[in-house]
Interface confidence: medium
C-alpha cells in the first residue's frame, strides 16, 4: 500500500494506491482511492507512466478528457465514473500489454487540494492449473497442465503423505511456446503415484502463485485449485 | 492562458555548463509534460529531452545522453536544461515547449528561446 | 532514430498562389506528424497535427494530409504573413524529430 499526500500550494489530500498486477491480453485494474469531495466537477484525476509523455487517463468536470492521452493507452482506459465522487480514482485497463508494466502515478486534485502516490505495475501471465490423472500412461501418473504463464515459471510437487519429499526425479516438466509467442503452456508430469494421496503442483515466477490439488482415491478424484499475486502491497 | 517564459542570453565559455530555465504560468504544471528544443543559427530543430515535472525523471536524446540534465522544480513550476561541456557548436537557441494535442505528442505551447552562445 | 526529408529546400510562391511541400519519413510514421511554421526571430508555431489536424486559431487556407511515409502541407491561398520556414515533425517513434524545413519565399 503506498499512501501520498499532496503537493505544495494548496492543502494536501490523502492518495493511496496499491501495487498490483496484470495478466496479458486481459483486464487489469490499477487501484487507487483518495478523499472524496462533495462536487464531482471539482475532481480532476490524472493517470501518469513513468516514461510516457503522454498521459495514461484524465477525468474532470466528471467526464473522461482524453485529449491529452497517450496512444499506447488509447482506447483501453476507463475509470469508475459513478464512484469518482466516493473516492475511487482506479483505472480499469483493457487488453493488458507486457509494455504495461512500470511506475504509475495517480494524481488527483480536488477543491480540498492535491496529492499523488505510485503504483508498481508489472506484467506477466497466470493462469490456474489444473491437475488430472493421466490413464495413457504405463504406470500411475498426474499431468498438471496451466495454459498460460510469463515469466517462465517453477513447477515443484508436492504430496501429503510424503511431505517435504523431493519429487524432482520423478517428474517432467514442460513448457511450450503459445501461439502469440509470449506466453508458455506450463505442463509437468508426476510419475509413481500411490493411491489415498494428495497431490499438489505448485507453479510459481515473481508475479503469481498457483497450485493446482488432486486427491486420488479408490473411490473418487477430488480436485481443487487457487492462484494468488504475489505483488499486492499497498502504497 | 498557459505561457512558456524562459530566461535570458548567456554567453558562455568552450568546456563550462549553462542552466536555461522555463517558468510556465496560467495552468497545471505538474503532470504536462515539458521538452526542450534546440535550433543552432540558421539550422533546423533539434529535439533533446523531455520531463514530467510530478514524475522528475527525464528522458533524453541519444545524442545528448551524458551531457544534458532536465530538471523540474513543482513549487516554482520552472523547468530547466543544464548543458555541460559545452563547445561552440552548441551556440543554438534553446526552447522550451510543452506537449499538447493527441497524446502530448505534438508540442502546442512554445516558450519564445533563449540564445546561448558558446565563444572563447 | 527516423529521418525526415522535406522537399524543396526552398519554395518561390507568388501571393495568392497555392504551395505545396512535402515531407518524407524513412520508416512508417502512420499519421503521427506534425507541422510547424516558423518566422525570423520568433519561436515555431503548431500548425497542424495527427498529419491533417489544424491546431487552434489556424486558418483553414493550411491543410495537411498523407501517412505512412509521405507527406504533404498544402497553403491554398499563400498571404503575405505565410512567408516563413516550415518543419513538419514525426512523433510516432521517440525521439520524435524534424526535418531540415522548408523555406517558402515571395516570388
Known amino acids: 500500500l503506498i499512501i501520498g499526500f499532496g503537493i505544495s500550494g494548496r492543502h494536501s489530500i490523502t492518495v493511496t494506491t496499491v501495487a498490483s498486477a496484470g495478466n496479458i491480453g486481459e483486464d487489469g485494474i490499477l487501484s487507487c482511492t483518495f478523499e472524496p469531495d462533495i462536487k464531482l466537477s471539482d475532481i480532476v484525476i490524472q493517470w501518469l507512466k513513468e516514461g510516457v509523455l503522454g498521459l495514461v487517463h484524465e477525468f474532470k468536470e466528471g467526464k473522461d478528457e482524453l485529449s491529452e492521452q497517450d496512444e499506447m493507452f488509447r482506447g483501453r482506459t476507463a475509470v469508475f465514473a459513478d464512484q469518482v465522487i466516493v473516492g475511487n480514482a482506479s483505472l480499469r485497463l483493457k487488453n493488458v500489454q507486457l509494455t504495461d508494466a512500470g511506475t504509475y502515478k495517480c494524481y488527483i486534485i480536488t477543491s480540498k487540494g492535491k496529492g499523488n502516490a505510485n503504483l508498481e505495475y508489472k506484467t506477466g501471465a497466470f493462469s490456474m492449473p489444473e491437475v488430472n490423472v493421466d490413464y495413457n500412461a504405463s504406470s500411475e501418473t498426474l499431468r498438471c497442465e496451466a495454459p498460460r504463464w510469463f515469466p517462465q515459471p517453477t513447477v515443484v510437487w508436492a504430496s501429503q503423505v510424503d511431505q517435504g519429499a523431493n519429487f524432482s526425479e520423478v517428474s517432467n516438466t514442460s513448457f511450450e511456446l503459445n501461439s502469440e509467442n509470449v506466453t508458455m503452456k506450463v505442463v509437468s508430469v508426476l510419475y509413481n503415484v500411490t493411491i489415498n494421496n494428495t497431490y499438489s503442483c505448485m507453479i510459481e515466477n515473481d508475479i503469481a502463485k498457483a497450485t493446482g490439488d488432486i486427491k486420488v482415491t479408490e473411490s473418487e478424484i477430488k480436485r481443487r485449485s487457487h492462484l494468488q499475486l504475489l505483488n499486492s502491497k499497498a502504497s | 492562458q498557459v505561457q512558456l517564459v524562459q530566461s535570458g542570453a548567456e554567453v558562455k565559455k568552450p568546456g563550462s555548463s549553462v542552466k536555461v530555465s522555463c517558468k510556465a504560468s496560467g495552468g497545471t504544471f505538474s503532470s504536462y509534460a515539458i521538452s526542450w528544443v534546440r535550433q543552432a543559427p540558421g539550422q533546423g530543430l533539434e529535439w533533446m529531452g523531455g520531463?514530467?515535472?510530478?514524475?522528475?525523471?527525464?528522458s533524453y536524446a541519444q545524442k545528448f545522453q551524458g551531457r544534458v540534465t532536465i530538471t523540474a522544480d513543482e513549487s516554482t513550476s520552472t523547468a530547466y536544461m543544464e548543458l555541460s561541456s559545452l563547445r561552440s557548436e552548441d551556440t543554438a537557441v534553446y526552447y522550451c515547449?510543452?506537449?499538447?494535442?493527441?497524446?502530448?505528442?505534438?508540442?502546442?505551447?512554445w516558450g519564445r528561446g533563449t540564445l546561448v552562445t558558446v565563444s572563447s | 532514430e527516423i529521418v525526415m526529408t522535406q522537399s524543396p529546400a526552398t519554395l518561390s510562391v507568388s501571393p495568392g498562389e497555392r504551395a505545396t511541400l512535402s515531407c518524407r519519413a524513412s520508416q512508417s510514421v502512420s499519421s503521427n506528424l506534425a507541422w510547424y511554421q516558423q518566422k525570423p526571430g520568433q519561436a515555431p508555431r503548431l500548425l497542424i497535427y495527427?498529419?491533417?489536424t489544424r491546431a487552434t486559431g489556424i486558418p483553414a487556407r493550411f491543410s495537411g494530409s498523407g501517412s505512412g511515409t509521405e507527406f504533404t502541407l498544402t497553403i491554398s491561398s499563400l498571404q503575405s504573413e505565410d512567408f516563413a520556414v516550415y518543419y513538419c515533425q514525426q512523433v510516432n517513434v521517440w525521439p520524435p524529430t524534424f526535418g531540415g524545413g522548408t523555406k517558402v519565399e515571395i516570388k
Open positions: 520531463i514530467i515535472p510530478i514524475f522528475g525523471t527525464a
Open positions: 515547449a510543452r506537449q499538447q494535442y493527441d497524446g502530448r505528442r505534438y508540442f502546442g505551447l
Open positions: 495527427s498529419a491533417s
